[in-house]
Interface confidence: low
């Protein structure tokens, strides 16, 4: 299709070499009542806020994204050619930073319902640059933590070196939805709830004598609880003896609950005690069976191909540990009568 009629938007992504940050492009199709590009009758003005990345209509819930090769080759379908770029409805997610992401990206509705819609498209010219020393060296992280129940703030990485007074007007999005009341370089959160977790996008406009462009940054915000003050507790096994049948295979499961730690390094292992000897057993990898904001339950099994008389004399010990301390639970096997 002819892209000469597409509205054009220029964006700048200055990525930090320090973090594996993400980036997004919204399919900002022009507002119907302000533009001749899109079919006028699709949405009433009331349905469309000033700037809406996800248009609320079913017609626009799915769009087609293309990249325009710099050598003038035909447009390429993003989904086929770029595995590090993921399309989610009206948003294009760039999973890895790099100057090779620079280029022109075009989006348009998949459903073409009228002749007017053919030209309903947006061309986004994306420039990607690594952050230089001249730019702010200690900008806010692209991963930010908010402590549940406390006050906090989310800083726009590309503006965090500027004071609030210097800062230009910022447009914020959370999970693709416009946060219309937020205009400063920092979102202040009076009390943090789990719904504050998500992907935040901050945009502001920069210009020189020739043109203007949007500077965009993406912040992944996670809500966390304070580090646990408790050592892990073993949920299973509860009993210290277990009835078994000789000659039969046996699996003993150790399940332990670990409280949240910002640097999470759980240890869960089995070892065997036999009179004065003890040794760690090679067992299948531990797996997380339940994860919440406050804690995580991890399971690790010990598998005996068949229970022998010798096993009845041994103690099977599950050992779990976090940065606070460790807990053990031993199991003695007893022959079923």
């Amino acid at each position: 299709f002819n892209i000469s009629g597409c509205s054009t938007k220029k964006l700048l992504w200055t990525y930090s070499t320090r973090s594996e940050e993400e980036f997004v492009l919204f399919c900002d199709l022009p507002e119907p009542q302000k533009s001749h590009f899109c079919h006028r009758n699709r949405l009433s003005p009331k349905q469309v806020p000033e700037h809406l990345p996800f248009m609320g209509s079913n017609d626009l819930s799915d769009v087609q994204w293309y990249q325009q090769p710099s050598n003038g080759d035909p447009l390429e379908d993003i989904r086929k050619s770029y595995p590090h770029i993921i399309q989610d409805k009206c948003t294009l997610h760039f999973l890895t930073p790099g100057v090779n992401n620079s280029g022109s990206y075009i989006c348009r509705p998949k459903m073409i319902k009228s002749p007017y819609d053919v030209a309903c498209c947006v061309k986004m010219i994306l420039e990607v640059k690594p952050q230089t020393n001249a730019s702010c060296e200690y900008s806010a992280s692209h991963k930010q933590d908010l402590l549940l129940g406390s006050t906090g703030s989310i800083s726009c990485p590309s503006l965090s070196c500027q004071s609030d007074a210097q800062s230009p007007a910022v447009t914020w999005y959370k999970n693709g939805k416009l946060l219309s009341v937020e205009r400063s370089n920092r979102i202040v959160v009076d009390e943090v709830y789990d719904y504050h977790q998500g992907t935040y996008v901050c945009d502001y406009t920069q210009s020189d004598t020739v043109s203007s462009w949007t500077v965009r940054a993406v912040v992944q915000v996670r809500t966390i609880v304070g580090d646990t003050k408790l050592k892990p507790d073993i949920l299973d096994p509860v009993e210290d003896t277990l009835e078994v049948e000789l000659g039969k295979p046996l699996t003993i499961s150790c399940k332990a609950r670990f409280g949240f730690e910002r640097v999470f390094n759980p240890v869960i292992k089995w070892y065997i005690k036999d009179s004065d000897l003890e040794w760690e057993v090679s067992v299948p990898e531990a797996k997380s069976i339940k994860s919440t904001l406050k804690d995580e339950i991890i399971e690790r099994n010990i598998i005996l191909e068949k229970v022998t008389q010798r096993d009845l004399r041994r103690k099977f010990v599950c050992f779990v540990q976090n940065s606070i301390g460790n807990t053990t639970q031993s199991v003695q096997l007893k022959e079923k009568r």
Epitope: Y138, K143, D145, S150, R186, S323
Partner: antibody
Framework: QVQLQQSGPGLVKPSETLSLTCTVS????????WSWIRQPPGKGLEWIGY???????NYNPSLKSRVTISVDTSKNQFSLKLSSVTAADTAVYYC??????????????????WGQGTTVTVSS | AIQLTQSPSSLSASVGDRVTITCRAS??????LAWYQQKPGKAPKLLIY???SLESGVPSRFSGSGSGTDFTLTISSLQPEDFATYYC?????????FGQGTRLEIK
């Protein structure tokens, strides 16, 4: 850009409490963890503990019984108190920012901004 | 606590030399290791994080490698400003610990 300015006395008497403050300028104290580290003369670095802007702390077990780290978000500063000091606590004390790194699908933390250091001598 | 042992403790080298410093952890720490440079009377400066990622603004002659228990910091061609003490640091589990340091001196 973020800078850390340390303040506090350079001389403390044995058995007294060492108190240092670190003021954050050029950025907010919110959303970050803030650490204290010390370095005895001619020796290596020892991590004392950290505080999150909300007040959550974690201390080195070797010093835990004597250490208190607190934060005052309204003043954009955090502080270290070390009680019952002895000559072994003589060191250069540093404050630092811990920044979260999104590395290999995990969160790691490194100290990317440091204060200028305060030499504290414990002597009567 | 996880112990980090650096070797050598001190090292003499000339401008232009290739230098390697090693750091061994007493238990596996994945890649949660950082390297810092410290000059006399100054605070440490972050060089490498996540074992091999170069901090913004640090010259590319510095590189890090390793995972698990064995890590190395390499300076491909020593410059006069590189003479300093280097520390490794683990952030895999508490308490956070540093190596004892490697002092790099001019030969």
């Amino acid at each position: 850009q973020v800078q850390l300015q340390q303040s506090g006395p350079g001389l403390v008497k044995p058995s007294e409490t060492l108190s240092l403050t670190c003021t954050v300028s050029g950025g907010s104290i919110n959303n970050y963890y803030w650490s204290w580290i010390r370095q005895p003369p001619g020796k290596g670095l020892e991590w004392i503990g950290y505080i999150f802007y909300s007040g959550t702390t974690n201390y080195n077990p070797s010093l835990k019984s004597r250490v208190t780290i607190s934060v005052d978000t309204s003043k954009n500063q955090f502080s270290l108190k070390l009680s019952s000091v002895t000559a072994a606590d003589t060191a250069v004390y540093y404050c630092a920012r811990d920044v979260g790194i999104a590395a290999r699908n995990s969160y790691y933390y490194v100290m990317d901004v440091w204060g200028q250091g305060t030499t504290v001598t414990v002597s009567s | 606590a996880i112990q980090l042992t650096q070797s050598p403790s001190s090292l003499s080298a000339s401008v232009g030399d290739r230098v390697t410093i090693t750091c061994r952890a007493s238990q596996g720490i994945s890649s949660a290791l950082a390297w810092y440079q410290q000059k006399p009377g100054k605070a440490p400066k972050l060089l490498i994080y996540d074992a091999s990622s170069l901090e913004s603004g640090v010259p590319s002659r510095f590189s890090g490698s390793g995972s698990g228990t064995d890590f190395t910091l390499t300076i491909s061609s020593l410059q006069p400003e590189d003479f300093a003490t280097y520390y490794c640091q683990q952030f895999n589990s508490y308490p956070i610990t540093f190596g004892q340091g490697t002092r790099l001196e001019i030969k």
